[in-house]
């Protein structure tokens, strides 16, 4: 009879988001009497291992299509052909390989948010940096100098409180103020640099009694 | 030449703590993890616990949870298997092995290890 | 957690045909990675994803898995095949890797 696939249940994840380098395997698992073809195409045309630099596996009994060591330039659709002289059944499958490209830190949206304390108790700010390389993680805050916000060229006073480099793409840093005063109040930052740029979050601390 | 060098063999005490290096080679060392697997003499493989060279992110087998820590140096492609409070029974080869991801359309996604270093001998003894 | 059984040990005459068994509770709805130990040497993997072989492995391997048994299969199996043979699935529920207790293989002769 026609070609029909053994395993459907398990088809149904047509789209593979995968990183880079790791290793593709398309299988469309059928049976027919007589046994079917599979053939395989991307893009809409025949598929062959001299298509792509490492070439790809095809192995028939298995119904399968390995790739090695995905580029993005794998990027595709990758459709099964199985075929018998009683009919013909496809599926296409959309492979996406994630690339790991480095951009500036991103900060988390809404972090660290402002807040009010009483005098004399312990507050803590929040701030969820994101960085492909490696991230050097600042909280600073800004101050006065002879009375001044700004020096001569316009940039603001800042004190650095804490600073390191992060060896986490994603680090999630807190700053802890213990037994706050009112000469704590203010404007602080936490900024996050790397080699391709910066990013930055200005945030309050409002000090009553 | 993809390759994975480890650090020499260690002669350590009970309680003491031992720290086994594997440098990559031959690869970018960020696209794929490292585990880290050990074999007693005459046992079988026993897996410790495996880090993200891309995010630092751990998992350590509940075995070795709080006595292990595993870190890598992105600077050197270098992974660290750190292993405290040293006994007897943890006398064994420790093996770090890169760590691949195998995607499959029906099965989902599946880890393995496709190249090994070649081993660290750690003798505990008093 | 998965727990994956192997035989400790087997003996196959050079020629022929070696069968290893790596038996886990619906392991045929797990992917199965085989590795191969020399004495004194660090494992090598010969076969991923059940049934897919890296390059340099030759065709007398092969592999399946059904049920509740992955299969690694050798034939016209040489003295140089003489070693430990594990098997390895990732357990995706806990993110662990799991490997079998090994099977020593043994040529005869």
């Known amino acids: 009879g026609a070609p029909y696939w053994t395993r459907p249940e398990r088809m149904d994840k047509k789209l593979l988001a995968v990183p880079a380098a790791n290793t593709v395997r398309f299988r469309c698992p059928a049976a027919g009497n007589p046994t079917p073809s599979i053939s395989w195409l991307k893009n809409g045309r025949e598929f062959r291992g001299e298509h792509r630099i490492g070439g790809i596996k095809l192995a028939h009994q298995q119904w399968s299509l390995v790739m090695e060591s995905v580029v993005p330039s794998d990027r595709g659709n990758y459709t099964c052909v199985v075929e018998n002289k009683f009919g013909s059944i496809r599926q296409t499958y959309t492979l996406d390989v994630l690339e790991r490209s480095p951009h500036r830190p991103i900060l988390q949206a809404g972090l660290p948010a402002n807040q009010t304390a009483v005098l004399g108790s312990d507050v803590e700010f929040h701030c969820k940096v994101y960085s492909d390389a490696q991230p050097h993680i600042q909280w600073l805050k800004h101050v006065e100098v002879n009375g001044s916000k700004v020096g001569p060229d316009g940039t603001p006073y800042v004190t650095v409180l804490k600073s390191w480099i992060s060896e986490s793409v994603e680090a999630d840093v807190r700053l802890r103020l213990a037994n706050v005063s009112e000469r704590d109040g203010g404007e602080y930052l936490c900024r996050a640099t790397n080699f391709i740029g910066v990013a930055e979050k200005a945030f309050w601390l409002s000090v009553h009694g | 030449e993809v390759q994975l060098v480890q650090s020499g063999a260690e002669v350590k005490k009970p309680g003491a703590s031992v720290k086994v290096s594997c440098k990559a080679s031959?690869?970018?060392?960020?696209?794929?993890?490292i585990s880290w697997v050990r074999q007693a003499p005459g046992q079988g493989l026993e897996w410790m616990g495996w880090?993200?060279?891309?995010?630092?992110?751990?998992n350590y087998a509940q075995k070795f949870q709080g006595r292990v820590t595993v870190t890598t140096d992105t600077s050197t492609s270098t992974a660290y298997m750190e292993l405290r409070s040293l006994r007897s029974e943890d006398t064994a080869v420790y093996y770090c092995?890169?760590?691949?991801?195998?995607?499959?359309?029906?099965?989902?996604?599946?880890?393995?290890?496709?190249?090994w270093g070649q081993g660290t001998t750690v003798t505990v003894s008093s | 957690q998965s727990v994956l059984t192997q035989p400790p040990s087997l003996s196959v005459a050079p020629g022929k045909t070696a069968t290893f068994t790596c038996g886990g509770n619906?392991?045929?709805?797990?992917?199965v990675h085989w590795y191969r130990q020399k004495p004194g040497q660090a494992p090598v993997l010969v076969m991923y994803?059940?049934?897919e072989r890296p390059s340099g492995i030759p065709e007398r391997m092969s592999g399946s898995n059904f049920g509740n048994t992955a299969t690694l299969t050798i034939t016209r199996v040489e003295a140089e095949d003489e070693a430990d043979y594990y098997c390895?699935?990732?357990?995706?529920?806990?993110?662990?890797?799991?490997f079998g207790g090994g099977t020593k293989l043994t040529v005869l002769g």
């Open positions: 092995a890169r760590v691949l991801g195998y995607y499959d359309s029906i099965d989902g996604y599946y880890y393995g290890m496709d190249v």
């Open positions: 031959g690869y970018m060392f960020t696209s794929y993890g």
């Open positions: 880090v993200s060279t891309y995010n630092g992110d751990t």
């Open positions: 619906n392991i045929g709805d797990k992917s």
């Open positions: 994803l059940d049934t």
């Open positions: 390895q699935v990732w357990d995706s529920g806990s993110d662990h890797v799991v």
